[in-house]
Amino acid sequence: ESGYAQNGDLEDAELDDYSFSCYSQLEVNGSQHSLTCAFEDPDVNITNLEFEICGALVEVKCLNFRKLQEIYFIETKKFLLIGKSNICVKVGEKSLTCKKIDLTTIVKPEAPFDLSVVYREGANDFVVTFNTSHLQKKYVKVLMHDVAYRQEKDENKWTHVNLSSTKLTLLQRKLQPAAMYEIKVRSIPDHYFKGFWSEWSPSYYFRTPEINNSSGEMDPI
């Protein structure tokens, strides 16, 4: 396979919908940034299709993406992060569709991690803490976090809390007693960068104490 389309292939290609979306991750591996693109139609035949980014790069004019199954991926230090780049879907030397994108407006943060919940008996509350790799970064340092929690039996009844810090207090009286809860967190750029929600952190599960009948308070576990 040369990677170049035959004439018939090119005519077929022009009938397809090659709309795509991309997200960037800055300083995802030391000082390296990444850019990930994928077709919006999962049925597109990607056999001979390549992605290329040109413009707003350091020391080079263009960069080619690596193909990883259904996604296209670049990891590099060469993003200038100033101005717009042109990202194109190509068959051989022919561009099928292109998008002008500023990579600082399509940032997807890394998922938060180390989510945990600690019950404070004296305070009758739960302290939720988590970590994010972005605290150490030069660029995308300011994030908005979305903490979502639900009673395990309530399939889709998530309660969401937005916060800018990595610590949240949940009052015991706002939760059901003797119930199992699931909690998770994700992040989005806030100030200076724009983009998308991160993946969710792994879920953490915790149980609320029983109510102590004499006082009306919950018993610790």
Partner: nanobody, 118 residues
């Protein structure tokens, strides 16, 4: 048509400072990258500094790194170039540019003269 108007140039002694301003008429200013360049008599235009739409990312030419600082105020549609430790070789016409799109600056100002005397 986008208009860029530079100001703040003038005559300054070596070792002194100047702050250039560039005001843009563009409605898209807060989405656009901005840059500063200069051109000395008989020389090619030289890149000095650039800043992304939010001000979070900056990039400098080697000749001014550590001496010049680019910044912006999106509420005022203005980009600035703070120039410190000026040298006679910084004498030039200074230009601002807007909207860095696939390696081409789309809009240019008329320039402001900076003269550094020894």
């Amino acid at each position: 048509e986008v208009q860029l108007v530079e100001s703040g140039g003038g005559l300054v002694q070596a070792g002194g400072s100047l702050r250039l301003s560039c005001e843009s008429s563009a409605r898209t200013f807060s989405d656009d990258a901005m840059g500063w360049f200069r051109q000395a008599a008989g020389k090619e235009r030289e890149f000095l500094a650039a800043i992304n739409w939010s001000g979070a990312v900056t990039h400098y030419g080697d000749s001014v790194k550590g001496r010049f600082t680019i910044s912006r105020d999106n509420a005022k549609n203005t980009v600035y170039l703070q120039m410190d430790s000026l040298k006679p070789e910084d004498t030039a016409v200074y230009y601002c540019a807007e909207d860095y799109d696939t390696d081409v600056w789309q809009h240019w100002g008329q320039g402001t003269q900076v003269t550094v005397s020894s």
